[in-house]
């Protein structure tokens, strides 16, 4: 006869451990007890649990209430056990030992791997700003036994670098994503892949990213100049602009207070009826917390009764 | 000797509840699992319940599921039986048996217990 | 869960005569199948264990054999202690179940 058992288990921590030992018997033969032990070098046997066709089966105390036999069906020459809840320190070798009439003693080796399936974290970088070289915009780890692979999942144009710690008995590894920061890459998600063979599926961890910036701003309204005319109703100025986050708006009169009348309401500046009074230099103040932008233009209001004509110059500050 | 002895059968209304015991002597009972086999009066045997040599895992006949629990005690060499919510479809003598070790078959018996459960 | 079928129900014997008791299990159990033996007013006894093997202490006019679903208990020679009714049970899978019993009555 001979035994039957596998070179290595592997198991998920927390899981049981089917420690599999079967006698493979001529017909008539019988066997009457199954020791299992913990044969790592160094350590010495430590003795789990002994099987014995008459006296049932015997758990060592550091193992009591660990070691069970697997449900049934069980075959009378399979002494496998089950080691519950397997946790780190029970890695390593196992033997079995089975005493078997009329053939006599067998033994085997095997290796109990147990995966520790990684709980990955993402940090997110520093605030991101238009304008910056190439920056951290994330950071992901994870921590596991064997070590886990970190890979990113993006449609951003990046560059990713990897290090590894490792420890007596897992090992971690951190996956750093770092960018040139763009507007366009607002909202845009990133993706933290996590694989582990202790892992049904890859574990995935998204941040959203957020890039500050300001768009350069610009007045829109005064593209029809002979519009702005003495007696015109529902003549506005808009300011035009973007941000992250998102700008306010602050309209002035440069060259004194806005005339009587005039409503600011956001980005857009109202008029009632045009009178020549209306005519000035008015100001649109954009700002974020990343920056500030101004965008200045000259009204010109045309009165009919003077035979002039209207002149707008549009200038833009930053 | 190896034996097993019941004990905590009796007469209990519908809805009530008893707890049978069995002491295990000449054996460690906790080096096997064990198990509850009842039988009704003028009827067959039947599985009720099983528990596992380190008390890990518990198996139930749908019949008693929810109403019944396992449970054992290695230090004191004994195994239990709480029956709750009792029908008159429990009443039965009532089994302790013991699993081999290599096979599962019952090779130890206990001399049974009755259990009555009527109005 | 696995349905087991005793056949006969009922059979009568005299002594020295040999007895079949056939057990038939609903879906494919290997040989993890048991034979007990139980008298009035007592508990079963284990008879056979893995469809084949004598448990110690049991006379060997007894024998088991079959496998998958169909599986038979033999009594070579009746004897007079061996009128009783006989109890197939799978030990497959949980929930273990038995079969109805066969009673072996004397003719």
């Known amino acids: 006869g001979e035994l039957e058992t596998s070179d290595v288990v592997t198991v998920v921590l927390g899981q049981d451990a089917k420690l599999p030992c079967f006698y493979r018997g001529d017909s008539g033969e019988q066997v009457g007890q199954v020791a299992w032990a913990r044969a790592d070098a160094g350590e010495g046997a430590q003795e789990l649990a002994l099987l014995h066709s008459k006296y049932g089966l015997h758990v060592s105390p550091a193992y009591e209430g660990r070691v069970e036999q697997p449900p049934p069906p069980r075959n009378p020459l399979d002494g496998s056990v089950l080691l519950r809840n397997a946790v780190q320190a029970d890695e390593g070798e196992y033997e079995c030992r089975v005493s078997t009439f009329p053939a006599g003693s067998f033994q085997a080796r095997l290796r109990l791997r147990v995966l520790v399936p990684p709980l990955p974290s993402l940090n997110p970088g520093p605030a991101l700003e238009e304008g910056q070289g190439l920056t951290l915009a994330a950071s992901c780890t994870a921590e596991g036994s064997p070590a886990p692979s970190v890979t990113w999942d993006t449609e951003v144009k990046g560059t990713t670098s990897s290090r590894s710690f490792k420890h007596s008995r897992s090992a971690a590894v951190t996956s750093e994503f770092h960018l040139v920061p763009s507007r366009s890459m607002n909202g845009q998600p990133l993706t933290c892949v996590v694989s582990h063979p202790g892992l049904l599926q890859d574990q995935r961890i998204t941040h959203i990213l957020h890039v500050s910036f300001l768009a350069e701003a610009s007045v829109r309204g005064l593209e029809d100049q002979n519009l702005w005319h003495v007696g015109r109703e529902g003549a506005m100025l808009k300011c035009l602009s973007e941000g992250q986050p998102p700008p306010s708006y602050n309209w002035t009169r440069l060259d004194g207070p806005l005339p009587s009348g005039v409503r600011v309401d956001g980005d857009t500046l109202g008029f009632p009826p045009l009178t020549t009074e209306h005519s000035g230099i008015y100001v649109c103040h954009v700002s974020n917390e990343f920056s500030s932008r101004d965008s200045q233009v000259t009204v010109d209001v045309l009165d009919p009764q003077e035979d002039s004509g209207k002149q707008v110059d549009l200038v833009s500050a930053s | 000797e190896v034996q097993l002895v019941e004990s905590g059968g009796g007469l209990v209304k519908p809805g009530g509840s008893l707890r049978l015991s069995c002491a295990a002597s000449?054996?460690?009972?906790?080096?096997?699992?064990m198990n509850w086999v009842r039988q009704a009066p003028g009827k067959g045997l039947e599985w009720v319940s099983s528990?596992?040599?380190?008390?890990?895992?518990?198996y139930y006949a749908d019949s008693v599921r929810g109403r019944f629990t396992i449970s054992r005690d290695n230090a004191k060499n004994s195994l239990y039986l709480q029956m709750n919510s009792l029908r008159a479809e429990d009443t039965a003598v009532y089994y302790c048996?013991?699993?081999?070790?290599?096979?599962?078959?019952?090779?130890?018996w206990g001399q049974g217990t009755l259990v009555t459960v009527s109005s | 869960d696995i349905q087991l079928t005793q056949s006969p129900s009922f059979l009568s014997a005299s002594v020295g005569d040999r007895v079949t008791i056939t057990c038939r299990a609903s879906?494919?159990?290997?040989?993890?199948l048991a034979w007990y033996q139980q008298k009035p007013g007592k508990a079963p006894k284990l008879l056979i264990y893995?469809?084949?093997t004598l448990q110690s202490g049991v006379p060997s006019r007894f024998s088991g054999s079959g496998s998958g679903t169909e599986f038979t208990l033999t009594i070579s020679s009746l004897q007079p202690e061996d009128f009783a009714t006989y109890y197939c049970?799978?030990?497959?899978?949980?929930?273990?179940?038995f079969g109805q019993g066969t009673k072996v009555e004397i003719k």
């Open positions: 048996a013991r699993g081999a070790v290599f096979h599962d078959a019952f090779d130890i």
């Open positions: 528990v596992s040599s380190g008390g890990g895992f518990r």
């Open positions: 000449g054996f460690n009972l906790n080096h096997y699992n």
């Open positions: 893995v469809a084949s």
């Open positions: 879906q494919d159990i290997s040989s993890y």
């Open positions: 049970q799978q030990i497959n899978s949980y929930p273990f179940t």
